[in-house]
């Protein structure tokens, strides 16, 4: 056959989805690789082709169409599965192309098991919820396009095994799931089953998120620097290793960038010839509230070393923070036979 | 931007409040201070007021100066005036929410006179 | 509260040559030192930061360093446009009044 544009195995979209329930897969074509859509590329005369590659196999076979109830079929740019099976695991290629043009790309597939408690291998998507911040809402994901707005399903919502009836402060509405105010006990896996009849039969669509509750806007701060402060001094003799924490404080903000960062009279420790390390490490609280701490490390510290601005520095989206350390050189003490000798009067 | 603005003549003992307007930047995530300069005479501390809150005096000015925020101002209020009081009346932003270390944008400044 | 001093005032260079300002501060303020230039009519404006860390667009002739309680300001290549009153600050931050400026020193330009 003549050449096709082929964008390889796109493990990027790792889908998964649960066994014995319905899936409808977009092919990644028009989504991610294609600069025009299903609708353009077929006026123009294109032919989307489905194929697959079982699991643990290298032969590529077509995908049967012809099954019994329709289970698997195509509409547009969608591979259906009505419902899945376990041994529907693998890699699926849809494949664009007439007798002139030909791009194709592939990617897996995974069938999964779940147990009666909705645990299973599934990559759970994680949904963050502002602590005490008035009422908030999760919405049942990826069950757009299942079924026609004429069709009402059944929504039923768990927290891990138990269905939510009568919990003190989150209310099933439908497809959304509302938390009057979120604590910190409603960190968990939330599974909603979406119940639907088609064609006579009765459908269930699984989808299980996380929730994690995380700190407020309401009270972010910027950054807080605990170390350096105004009441420790390093005060070290030439010889001795200097070692000073940077130790700051992140609140909580969705999407921001945390970082900290020393620098040695104005200048990044990497810019200079000072044999200086780094090192980081970084803990979180309940609320995903972040401490970071960068100790900078010199082994053998000169007493010029002694007379720089070692700053310690930090920025996240509410704003940036600095704190010098104190530095200084350790004044030797007197040697008692001579200085302290001569001021006794001794000759 | 910042700007001041509330400078006037006033009398002995006259109370005033200074307002520096900002734009362009949040309080919240900026330290202000205030900074005074009388006429031929050099630069003086007032005060600072960081993003967290946090309010810090010189020791001549606690009691009798008083800095406060807005969301878009913040305020230097002034009781007890006296002629040494007289001087152009700074606002400066810091580059950083927690201090003062540096303080590098400067309004241009408004004018107390305090004269019987 | 802490003292800075200032010295000398005024001091005079010669375009392309070298003017050295010194501060003393009258207890151990470690890195916490600033340096200002303002001239007549104008606010000041921030040179140095953290004893010797340049302000983004201030040149590299100006330079700060430090000895001890003893902080320097080092203007090399002089130029007409460097003609101002210089000031020190004390950023200590632990309460207001560590703020301190030093008395300011004029810089001539000859």
């Known amino acids: 056959s003549e050449r096709c544009d082929d964008w390889g195995l796109d493990t990027m979209r790792q889908i998964q989805v649960f066994e014995d329930e319905p899936a409808r897969i977009k092919c990644p074509l028009f989504e991610h690789f294609l600069k025009f859509n299903y609708s353009t590329a077929h006026s123009a005369g294109l032919t989307l082709i489905w194929y697959w590659t079982r699991q643990d196999r290298d032969l590529e076979e077509p995908i049967n169409f012809r099954l019994p109830e329709n289970r698997i079929s195509k509409e547009k740019d969608v591979l259906w599965f009505r419902p899945t099976l376990l041994n529907d695991t693998g890699n699926y290629t849809c494949m664009l192309r007439n007798t002139t043009y030909c791009s194709k790309v592939a990617f897996p597939l995974e069938v999964v098991q779940k147990d009666s408690c909705f645990n299973s291998p599934m990559k759970l998507p994680v949904h963050k919820l502002y602590i005490e911040y008035g009422i908030q809402r999760i919405t049942c994901p990826n069950v757009d396009g299942y079924f026609p707005s004429s069709v009402k399903p059944t929504i039923t919502w768990y927290m891990g095994c138990y269905k939510i009836q009568n919990f003190n402060n989150v209310i099933p509405e439908g497809m959304n799931l509302s938390f009057l105010i979120a604590l910190i006990s409603n960190n968990g896996n939330y599974t909603c089953v979406v119940t639907y009849p088609e064609n006579g039969r009765t459908f269930h669509l699984t989808r299980t998120l996380t929730v994690k509750v995380v700190g407020s806007p309401k009270n972010a701060v910027p950054p807080v620097i605990h170390s350096p402060n105004d009441h420790v001094v390093y005060e070290k003799e030439p010889g001795e290793e200097l070692l000073i924490p940077c130790t700051v404080y992140f609140s909580f903000l969705m999407d921001s960038r945390n970082e900290v960062w020393w620098t040695i009279d104005g200048k990044k420790p990497d810019d200079i010839t000072i044999d200086v390390t780094i090192n980081e490490s970084i803990s979180h609280s309940r609320t995903e509230d972040e401490t970071r701490t960068q100790i900078l490390s010199i082994k053998k510290v000169t007493s010029e070393d002694l007379k720089r601005s070692y700053v310690c520095h930090a920025r996240s989206a509410k704003g940036e923070v600095a704190k010098a350390a104190k530095v200084k050189q350790k004044v030797p003490a007197p040697r008692y036979t001579v200085e302290l000798a001569c001021g006794f009067g001794a000759t | 931007s910042v700007e001041e603005s509330g400078g006037r003549l006033v009398t002995p003992g006259t109370p005033l409040t200074l307002t520096c307007t900002v734009s362009?930047?949040?309080?919240?995530?900026?330290?202000m201070g205030w900074v005074r300069q009388a006429p031929g005479k050099g630069l003086e501390w007032i005060g600072i007021?960081?993003?967290?809150?946090s309010i810090y005096y010189a020791s001549w000015a606690k009691g009798r100066f008083t800095i406060s925020k807005t969301s878009t101002t913040v305020d230097l209020k002034m009781t007890s005036l006296t002629t040494e009081d007289t001087a152009t009346y700074f606002c400066?932003?810091?580059?950083?929410?927690?201090?003062?270390?540096?303080?590098?944008?400067w309004g241009q400044g408004t004018l107390v006179t305090v004269s019987s | 509260d802490i003292v800075m001093t200032q010295t000398p005032s005024p001091v005079s260079g010669a375009v392309g040559g070298t003017v050295t300002i010194k501060c003393q501060a009258s207890e151990d303020i470690y890195s916490n030192l600033a340096w200002y230039q303002q001239k007549p009519g104008q606010p000041p404006k921030l040179l140095i930061y953290?004893?010797?860390t340049l302000e983004s667009g201030v040149p590299s002739r100006f330079k700060g360093s430090r000895s001890g309680t003893d902080y320097t300001l080092t203007i090399s290549d002089l130029e007409s446009a460097d003609a101002a009153t210089y000031y020190c600050q004390c950023t200590e931050g632990g309460s207001g009044s560590d703020y301190t400026f030093g008395g300011g020193t004029e810089v001539v330009v000859k």
């Open positions: 362009g930047f949040s309080l919240d995530s900026y330290a």
């Open positions: 400066a932003r810091s580059a950083y929410s927690n201090n003062g270390d540096r303080l590098h944008l």
């Open positions: 007021i960081n993003s967290y809150g």
């Open positions: 953290y004893v010797s």
